[in-house]
């Protein structure tokens, strides 16, 4: 027998649907109406036929009471080819819901998103996460999506983006955005970061995550942040192959005094990089290739320094490698 596509936990909290049949029974998803966190995986299906079954231009207010009764607070939609018009229709309807967090993953968005009608209400999300989402509209996708959201977005995460750079002139400011995560875009690089950090569009950023984004030096990142006017309190550069030395011809970069936490773990560093901020509350240099203890003059003034998992701390080990097991408090790097 075929397993049920949707499973609701016994507390009406989590509901997961995996639609893998070529002709899925979408009505099975109705058992998720009482769930708080809902995940719908569409098995790579093309949702184009849906457009024939729904009126994407219908006034969503007619569904307002039905949608308000949904308990869903967090929704994940994955693995499908979605016409932009259908996505917009869904966003318009969900604007009447209690939805706070939306995750889109492994989606191919086809066609262009229509402009927001004057009478339409934007979706009041606090968090939007995108992973491996491709858009037919190229660089203007963020601006097109943004118009369907209210301006209170606090967390934006964009991973495995096909176009991590945005059409900055079309993007409006994100006044409430405190966390921006561009991790897992290995092709981004420092130039791409400059293009992605649209100047003065992210005025409230406190946390910036750039794990595995092809960054090369902390100084290069500093320059990109300075150019964009972005002053995070916390910066995560872990899982990048960082160079410790700075190009002598590159201008010196002054880090923002707002920065108090810097993560440089898993960065392949053989020495403490030059050009770090003068003062930090937290500096994580764990799981690098430091063969000797850093000298005080190599380090910023720092309250909380993590050096676990470096060769100089582990007697008799060579460079740390994936899956190595270390004793005591030393993490497996």
């Amino acid at each position: 027998t075929t397993p049920e596509p949707c499973e609701l936990d016994d507390e009406d909290f989590r509901c997961v649907c995996n639609f893998s049949e070529p002709q899925p029974d979408w009505s099975e998803a109705f058992q998720c109406v009482s769930a708080v966190e809902v995940e719908i995986h569409a098995g790579g299906l093309n949702l184009e036929p849906f457009l024939k079954r729904v009126d994407a231009d219908a006034d969503p207010r007619q569904y307002a009471d039905t949608v308000k009764a949904l308990r869903v607070r967090r929704l994940t939609v994955g693995a499908a080819q979605v016409p932009a018009q259908l996505l917009v229709g869904a966003l318009r309807v969900l604007a009447y819901s209690r939805l706070k967090e939306l995750t889109l993953e492994d989606l191919k968005i086809t066609g262009t998103m229509p402009p927001l009608p004057l009478e339409a209400t934007g979706l009041a999300l606090s968090s939007l996460r995108l992973r491996n989402v491709s858009w037919a509209t190229g660089r203007s996708w963020l601006a097109e999506l943004q118009q369907w959201l209210k301006p209170g977005l606090k967390v934006l995460s964009i991973a495995q983006a096909h176009s991590p750079a945005f059409s900055c002139e079309q993007v409006r400011a994100f006044p409430a955005l405190t966390s921006l995560d561009l991790s897992d875009n290995p092709g981004l690089g420092e130039r791409g970061l400059m293009a992605a950090l649209c100047p003065h569009k992210f005025p409230a950023i406190q946390n910036l995550a750039l794990r595995n984004t092809g960054m090369e030096t902390p100084t290069g990142v500093c320059a990109a942040l300075a150019a964009a006017g972005v002053q995070p309190h916390s910066l995560d550069l872990s899982h990048n192959s960082l160079r410790a030395t700075v190009n002598p011809s590159a201008p010196r970069c002054m880090w923002s005094s707002a920065l108090n936490s810097l993560n440089l773990s898993f960065a392949g560093l053989e020495q403490v990089p030059k050009g770090l901020p003068a003062k930090l509350r937290v500096l994580d240099l764990s799981c690098n290739r430091l063969n000797r203890a850093p000298q005080p003059d190599e380090l910023p003034e720092v309250d909380n320094l993590t050096l676990d998992g470096n060769p100089f701390l582990v007697p008799g080990t060579a460079l740390p490698h994936e899956g190595s097991m270390n004793s005591g408090v030393v993490p497996a790097c």
Epitope: E11, F13, R14, V33, S34, V36, E37, R74, R98, S127
Partner: antibody, heavy 115, light 111 residues
Framework: QVQLQESGPGLVKPSQTLSLTCTVS?????????WNWIRQPPGKGLEWIGY???????SYNPSLKSRVTISRDTSKNQFSLKLSSVTAADTAVYYC????????WGQGTLVTVSS | DIQLTQSPSSLSASVGDRVTITCRAS??????????LHWYQQKPGKAPKLLIY???NLQSGVPSRFSGSGSRTDFTLTISSLQPEDVATYYC?????????FGQGTKLEIK
């Protein structure tokens, strides 16, 4: 059978940060459900503080939101509460609880805010 | 926020009596076919214990003399035949919408 156990200091000074940890046994906090903090001032009723879900998503009571952080350590199967800028009004028994119909409770820990 | 108002605030009844506690919500706590209203019993110095979930479902291990009913905004907890061990404070709670809220409690004593 899921079991929850609160731990942390029983006395916190005014204006400081209250920190509590809940250790969960018999169930993984990443498999499903919401993992809540609820408090009860002496002789008073119950107040929901907030939760962290299996996915890491958080939801807080708006009356406390500016002072509350709930986080988790999945490697230890623990979740934690931090409540900043405490006053005497934050003196209460603090419970960690699983789910949104609160079927599984820790035994509670009394935190007194006093200088 | 959804306010829950319990009545009475306290009551005294004799062993064997049928006892009813009501809980009124400031707005509906229903989501489609379910009412997200639950009932708890708390004895002094102990954590609350879930008695009834989703308005009318008896939690495993709870004696069958406890029952719940109601929908939308009006709910009732009934003890069909009061026992000495039922002396406690009873709370209703809604989980339809955050912030999740409790009633102020009903203190039940034996005459």
């Amino acid at each position: 059978q899921v079991q929850l156990q609160e731990s942390g200091p029983g006395l916190v000074k005014p204006s400081q940060t209250l920190s509590l940890t809940c250790t969960v046994s018999g169930y993984s906090i990443t498999s499903d459900s919401a993992w809540n903090w609820i408090r009860q001032p002496p002789g008073k009723g119950l107040e929901w503080i907030g939760y962290i879900s299996y996915s890491g998503s958080t939801s807080y009571n708006p009356s406390l939101k500016s002072r509350v952080t709930i986080s988790r350590d999945t490697s230890k199967n623990q979740f934690s509460l931090k409540l900043s800028s405490v006053t005497a009004a934050d003196t209460a028994v603090y419970y960690c609880v699983r789910g949104l119909r609160f079927a599984y409770w820790g035994q509670g820990t009394l935190v007194t805010v006093s200088s | 926020d959804i306010q829950l108002t319990q009545s009475p605030s306290s009551l005294s009844a004799s062993v064997g009596d049928r006892v009813t506690i009501t809980c009124r919500a400031s707005e509906s706590v229903d989501s489609y076919v379910n009412s997200f209203l639950h009932w708890y019993q708390q004895k002094p110095g102990k954590a609350p214990k879930l008695l009834i979930y989703r308005a009318s479902n008896l939690q495993s291990g709870v004696p069958s003399r406890f029952s719940g009913s109601g929908s939308r905004t009006d709910f009732t907890l009934t003890i069909s035949s009061l026992q000495p061990e039922d002396v406690a404070t009873y709370y209703c709670q809604q989980s339809n919408e955050d912030p999740y809220t409790f009633g102020q409690g009903t203190k039940l004593e034996i005459k």
